[in-house]
Amino acid sequence: MMTGTIETTGNISAKKGGSVILQCHLSSTMAQVTQVNWEQHDHSLLAIRNAELGWHIYPAFKDRVAPGPGLGLTLQSLTMNDTGEYFCTYHTYPDGTYRGRIFLEVLESSVAEHSARFQIP
């Protein structure tokens, strides 16, 4: 039975040209995390962090994506096209797959504040 829950940074905003940290956290389960996948807009793999093999940033994103902190992901040099949904998928044993969602809004305004709070989606 899947007892875990994913907490994420929820809805966040950041400045164009700036950076943002995407974070998910799996709690309330003893399951072993074998791999975490990060996806953009549900159809592009950004990065994978495999427990045994470490991090891989996919070629199309190598210039703008940095691994961490932890199992999170840092997006750099943000553009307006980066606005949208991001998904963390936790592959675990024996529970199976947990998935969290973050919505990022990239703002033109110089007064845009990076708001990040943990919430259960």
Epitope: E39, D42, S44, L45, L53
Partner: antibody, heavy 117, light 107 residues
Framework: EVQLVQSGAEVKKPGASVKVSCKAS????????IEWVRQAPGQRLEWMGV????????NYKEKFKGRVTITADKSSSTAYMELSSLRSEDTAVYYC??????????WGQGTTVTVSS | DIVMTQSPDSLAVSLGERATINCKAS??????VAWYQHKPGQSPKLLIY???YRYTGVPDRFSGSGSGTDFTLTISSLQAEDVAVYYC?????????FGGGTKVEIK
Amino acid sequence: EVQLVQSGAEVKKPGASVKVSCKASGYAFTNYLIEWVRQAPGQRLEWMGVINPGSGGTNYKEKFKGRVTITADKSSSTAYMELSSLRSEDTAVYYCARGEYFFFDYWGQGTTVTVSS
Amino acid sequence: DIVMTQSPDSLAVSLGERATINCKASQHVSDGVAWYQHKPGQSPKLLIYSASYRYTGVPDRFSGSGSGTDFTLTISSLQAEDVAVYYCQQHYNTPHTFGGGTKVEIK
């Protein structure tokens, strides 16, 4: 030029072990994964496992756990795949491949392993 | 394990015509699909990764598309040297799994 050169064909008896080598050249050995894939006669390609030569970390397909061991020697830029308790169903061509993480951009020439009594 | 189902099993196409191969994943794999060409007596060769990115040196008649669970490899104008077996592979999660292969021949 990137090259992966594998050891020669092997004929083994059931219950025996086989160790296939894969010597890499033309790139930084520790910057890429080495994956092992096999193809039995008339079957699809089957991924067996992978090693990160830099860290030594490995990941195996569940069905091979306990029977396969993948190692890497950084000093000689060589990876090894040892499969034990061989059975007739292990008769196959065994490939090593360089992993651009989880897809495979260069492949060895293949090593035919025949298991027969 | 994620099951990759390819169709058709074989395909006969006239020279210069289009060949289309489909691959369906048993669960969501985002764009984590690669395509390989395998000729008899040779090692497999990477054509496409991340569903649609053509690997270095691969002719532009080869293209890939799809995301989620449904993927396609297209050879826009079949050449004699394209006769081979083509495999899809998911690189979304371990164990990495391959489709059953599609044999492409000249009609």
